[in-house]
C-alpha cells in the first residue's frame, strides 16, 4: 500500500532555514526574500514506528531527489547524513530504522528524534551557516525545536 507523504519546509526555533551544503549535507542559516527559494523542500512520509497522540514516525526525504536523512554510527557516534536510495523502492511504509524519526509535537514546536538512536535529535547550532546534525542533548545551546511549513505539491 502506498505511503502517505506531504511536502514541507522546516525552520528552527530561531527561524533559520535549511539549505543544501554540498551534495550530502544540510546547513541552517537565515534567509530572506528571494533567497527563501534556496531552502530545501522535504517530502515527509508517514512510516512504521512508535505512534501516539503527540508522536508520529516519519521519514524525511528531499523532494524529487533520491536522498533521505538517515542516522548511522560514525566513529561510535550517532551521526546525521543524507543517504542516497533507489527511487524505485522509496518511500515505503516500512522504512529501515535509520531513516525513521519520531516527530514529536510540544507547544506548537516540533522535535525530530532518531528512532535508531533514542534521545538523539535533529539539531542546528546557534551559529549561522553550520551543518544540521544529530545532537544528544535537548534544552542546551543547540537547537532541537522546529516549525513546519506546508508546501503545495
Amino acid at each position: 500500500a502506498p505511503v502517505r507523504s506531504l511536502n514541507c519546509t522546516l525552520r528552527d526555533s530561531q527561524q533559520k532555514s535549511l539549505v543544501m551544503s554540498g551534495p550530502y549535507e544540510l546547513k541552517a542559516l537565515h534567509l530572506q526574500g528571494q533567497d527563501m527559494e534556496q531552502q530545501v523542500v522535504f517530502s515527509m512520509s508517514f512510516v512504521q514506528g512508535e505512534e501516539s497522540n503527540d508522536k508520529i514516525p516519519v521519514a524525511l526525504g528531499l523532494k524529487e531527489k533520491n536522498l533521505y536523512l538517515s542516522c548511522v554510527l560514525k566513529d561510535d557516534k550517532p551521526t546525521l547524513q543524507l543517504e542516497s536510495v533507489d527511487p524505485k523502492n522509496y518511500p515505503k511504509k516500512k522504512m529501515e530504522k535509520r531513516f525513521v524519526f519520531n516527530k514529536i509535537e510540544i507547544n506548537n514546536k516540533l522535535e525530530f528524534e532518531s528512532a535508531q538512536f533514542p534521545n538523539w535529535y535533529i539539531s542546528t547550532s546557534q551559529a549561522e551557516n553550520m551543518p544540521v546534525f544529530l545532537g544528544g542533548t535537548k534544552g542546551g545551546q543547540d537547537i532541537t525545536d522546529f516549525t513546519m511549513q506546508f508546501v503545495s505539491s
Epitope: 500500500a1 502506498p2 512504521q48 514506528g49 512508535e50 505512534e51 501516539s52 523502492n89 515505503k92 511504509k93 516500512k94 529501515e96 530504522k97 535509520r98 535508531q116
Partner: antibody, heavy 119, light 107 residues
C-alpha cells in the same frame, strides 16, 4: 473492545478457490491495515497479505499470483480469495488487524478457520 | 525457507531467564516483533518495535534488536509462559515470520 470474526468454507477439493471473510466489530475500520495469515498444521505462521480501507494491497510474493484480498468498508469486512488450492494450502487461516499504535503490526487476531484441501 | 531464523526449541527451569533469538540479514535495521502462541489459540503480540510491551503483557517480557539478531527475553519464567514464540519483521515490503521456537518450562 475490538473483535474479528471470520468464516468461510472449511473443506475444499484441489483446484477450487478458497474464500474467507472477516468482520470487524468495535473500533474504526479506516485507521488500520487488515491482514491474512495462515498456519499449516503443526507448522509456523505465514503472512499472506494486507489491505487498507481504500483497497490498496500488499501480498506475499510466493502467493501473489493466486491471492486476492478485498474490502467492503460499508460492512466493516474484508475477504481473502486463494485460487487453485492444493493440499499444501491446508492450514488454519487467521485474519488480523495492523495498528499504528503498535508500529503497524498485528495486534488483534481472529479466532482462525481451519481449511482442509482434500480430494 | 524463512528469512528469519529461530532455534526450534528452548528449555528453561521455572524462575530462570529464557532467551529466544531471531536472526536475519541486517535485522537490527528493521523493527522486530514477537508473538506468543499457545496450542489451539491465536497468536498474541508480546513485544513490538523491538522492545515495547503491549498493555497487559507482564514486565518479565523484554526485547532487544541489533546487528543481525533480535532477542526475546523472559525473566523469571513461569509455567504459563510455555508456548511457541514467533519473531516477525518485514523484508522487501512484505511481512516475514520466523520459523518459531517452542519454549519448554521444565519441571
Amino acid at each position: 473492545q475490538v473483535q474479528l470474526q471470520q468464516w468461510g468454507a472449511g473443506l475444499l477439493k484441489p483446484s477450487e478457490t478458497l474464500s474467507l471473510t472477516c468482520a470487524v466489530y468495535g473500533g474504526s475500520f479506516s485507521d488500520y491495515y487488515w491482514s491474512w495469515i495462515r498456519q499449516p498444521p503443526g507448522k509456523g505462521l505465514e503472512w499472506i497479505g494486507e489491505i487498507d480501507h481504500s483497497g490498496s494491497t500488499n501480498y506475499n510474493p510466493s502467493l501473489k499470483s493466486r491471492v486476492t484480498i478485498s474490502v467492503d468498508t460499508s460492512r466493516n469486512q474484508f475477504s481473502l480469495s486463494l485460487s487453485s488450492v492444493t493440499a499444501a494450502d491446508t492450514a488454519v487461516y487467521y485474519c488480523a488487524r495492523a495498528s499504528p499504535s503498535s508500529g503497524w503490526t498485528l495486534d488483534y487476531w481472529g479466532q482462525g478457520t481451519l481449511v482442509t484441501v482434500s480430494s | 525457507q524463512s528469512v528469519l531464523t529461530q532455534p526450534p526449541s528452548v528449555s528453561v527451569s521455572p524462575g530462570q531467564t529464557a532467551s529466544i533469538t531471531c536472526s536475519g540479514d541486517k535485522l537490527g535495521d528493521k523493527f522486530a516483533f514477537w508473538y506468543q502462541q499457545k496450542p489451539g489459540q491465536s497468536p498474541v503480540l508480546v513485544i513490538y518495535l523491538d522492545n515495547k510491551r503491549p498493555s497487559g503483557i507482564p514486565e518479565r517480557f523484554s526485547g532487544s534488536n541489533s546487528g543481525n539478531t533480535a532477542t526475546l527475553t523472559i525473566s523469571g519464567t513461569q509455567a504459563l509462559d510455555e508456548a511457541d514464540y514467533y519473531c516477525y519483521a518485514w523484508d522487501n515490503a512484505y511481512e516475514v515470520f520466523g520459523g518459531g521456537t517452542k519454549l519448554t518450562v521444565l519441571g
